[in-house]
Interface confidence: low
């Protein structure tokens, strides 16, 4: 807590200018008002306070609004904002988009802090729902942020909003995440053509179902083996020698670099040796010539 | 009382997955952060990541991404960390903790900790 | 990732002695930093937030100390009761990061 002390004669402060940097942290506290430094605050970021002068600035704004400051205010913060603990930003009501991004610009290209964190879920709680222009916002300064949402947080995202995401967003989701964004990204992306729907679709196929994998395989769409490798296990066991050699096209040879690595692994015990003799790759683990193989899912489905 | 009580100490394979609880309890669960701490021998506190209950939203230190993902079920008031494919690295001391904004953003409450042993 | 150095691993001390513990940060991290206390078979309690507030209650002969990057944790009148590890810790930014802990032992 900053002294109160009068301010000396002639120093009070007519603006936030340059000449302030030169006052000592009690000049600050005693000639700066803080209705002028809360009209002014578009200034502070041209300014170079120093850390501790910085704290002097804040001291006097949370005196002027110890509930919480204005959107007015909020949105000229800037570097002022990393001075900010979670506590402050909890009593915010942010809701422009702009000074979301103008906050967020503040500590890019640095790891989330605690406050941007809290920042980011007063404003999405806020808007009751992650709506495209948001979405983009995030991503772009945070790629892995669609990835740290829950299942069901991500069930609220619409469709539209899949416009948004880069396929350096899904970097790290996982299959649970993925179920739940393939649907509304097939949505997004159904009126576009085969090869155009592919380019957008491929980083969503993590959770791609069987018989979406097999509508691909007639659309010589090519699959590269890192696609391949991310799509869910259980989706790729029904698919045939020949639907997989149509997915992947030219780039089916690295199969034979995956063979211990699940899907291609598991795939491999599925299929017939010959059927994957066919292949050329010296697939070795399928199912030997003669052996009679049992559809158990079929036989319960009868059952 | 606050209280965070985790799940019991576990014994388990090379290779496999491992889920430890941490139930809240005396406080409104949503309303605070959890994290997850490793404590390992001869090693100091290693902050593995953060959820936040209200969203499930998390963020994981680098390190332990992959390695640890982050759940909660607020009907029970529980958070959950799930380990895979464990190796004997992961032999350690794990703690939930709470992470209270009003006091800086500092863990203020933690639970018993759950020793997890990775051998086979 | 800011990196939290504690010097000094172990430190001798009697009953009723001065300790400090000291704490040194990689950057600048302000005053979010808060120092735990943990004794074996128990987990790690709040002593200090904000780098120098006690948190309830907690003895007032714990005091935090420092800003920026050099941060201590004062014992004033050692009791037997606070043989322990001390860890320091900064909430300035992700990932939050522990100093190693000091091990405070009787003479």
């Known amino acids: 807590e900053v002294e109160k002390t009068a301010c000396p004669s002639g120093k009070k402060a007519r603006e936030i200018d340059e000449s302030l940097i030169f006052y000592k942290k009690w000049e600050l506290e005693a000639c700066v008002d803080a209705a002028l430094l809360a009209t002014q605050m578009d200034r502070v970021n041209a300014i170079p306070f120093t850390y501790e002068q910085l704290d002097v600035l804040k001291h006097k704004l949370d005196e002027l609004y110890p509930q919480g400051y204005p959107e007015s205010v909020i949105q000229h913060l800037g570097y002022l904002f990393l001075k900010m603990s979670p506590e402050d930003i909890r009593k915010w009501n942010v809701t422009s988009l702009e000074t979301l991004k103008a906050l967020l610009e503040v500590n890019k290209g640095h790891e989330m802090s605690p406050q941007v964190a809290t920042l980011i879920d007063r404003f999405v709680k806020g808007r009751g729902q992650l709506d495209k222009d948001t979405l983009d916002t995030l991503t772009a300064f945070y790629p892995g942020y669609l990835c740290s949402l829950s299942p069901e947080e991500l069930s609220s995202v619409p469709p539209s909003s899949i416009w948004a995401v880069r396929p350096q967003d899904l970097d790290t989701c996982d299959p649970r995440q993925l179920d739940v964004l393939y649907p509304k990204a097939r949505l997004a992306f159904q009126n576009m053509n085969g090869s155009e729907y592919f380019v957008k679709i491929q980083s969503f196929l993590g959770g791609a179902p069987t018989e979406d994998l097999k509508a691909l395989s007639q659309q010589n769409v090519s699959m590269d083996l890192a696609t391949f490798m991310k799509l869910r296990t259980d989706a790729v066991l029904p698919l045939t020698v020949a639907e997989v050699q149509k997915l992947l096209g030219p780039h089916v040879e690295g199969l034979k670099a995956e063979e211990r690595h699940r899907p291609v692994r598991d795939w491999i015990l599925r299929q017939r040796q010959d059927d994957l003799d066919t292949l050329g790759l010296g697939l070795q683990g399928g199912i030997p010539n003669g052996y009679l193989v049992l559809d158990l899912s079929m036989q319960e489905a009868l059952s | 009382e606050f209280q965070l009580q985790q799940s019991g100490p576990e014994l388990v394979k090379p290779g496999a997955s491992v889920k430890i609880s941490c139930k809240a309890s005396g406080y409104s669960f949503t309303d605070y952060n959890m994290n997850w701490v490793k404590l390992s021998n001869g090693k100091s506190l290693e902050w593995i990541g953060v959820i936040i209950p209200n969203y499930g939203t998390s963020s994981y230190n680098q390190k332990f991404k992959g390695k640890a993902t982050l759940t909660v079920d607020q009907s029970s008031s529980t958070a959950y960390m799930q380990l895979n494919s464990l190796t004997s690295e992961d032999s350690a001391v794990y703690y939930c903790?709470?992470?209270?904004?009003?006091?800086?953003?500092?863990?203020?409450?933690w639970g018993q900790g759950t020793t997890l042993t990775v051998s086979s | 990732d800011i990196v939290m150095t504690q010097s000094q691993k172990f430190m001798s001390t009697t009953v009723g002695d001065r300790v400090s513990i000291t704490c040194k940060a990689s950057?600048?991290?302000?005053?979010?930093v808060a120092w735990y206390q943990q004794k074996p078979g128990q987990s790690p309690k709040l002593l200090i937030y904000s780098a120098s507030n006690r948190y309830t209650g907690v003895p007032d002969r714990f005091t935090g100390s420092g800003s920026g990057t050099d941060f201590i944790l004062t014992i004033s009148n050692m009791q037997s009761e606070d043989l322990a590890d001390y860890f320091c810790?900064?909430?300035?930014?992700?990932?939050?990061?522990f100093g190693a802990g000091t091990k405070l032992e009787l003479k």
């Open positions: 950057q600048n991290v302000g005053t979010a």
């Open positions: 810790q900064q909430y300035s930014s992700y990932p939050l990061t």
């Open positions: 903790a709470r992470w209270d904004n009003y006091y800086g953003s500092s863990l203020d409450y």
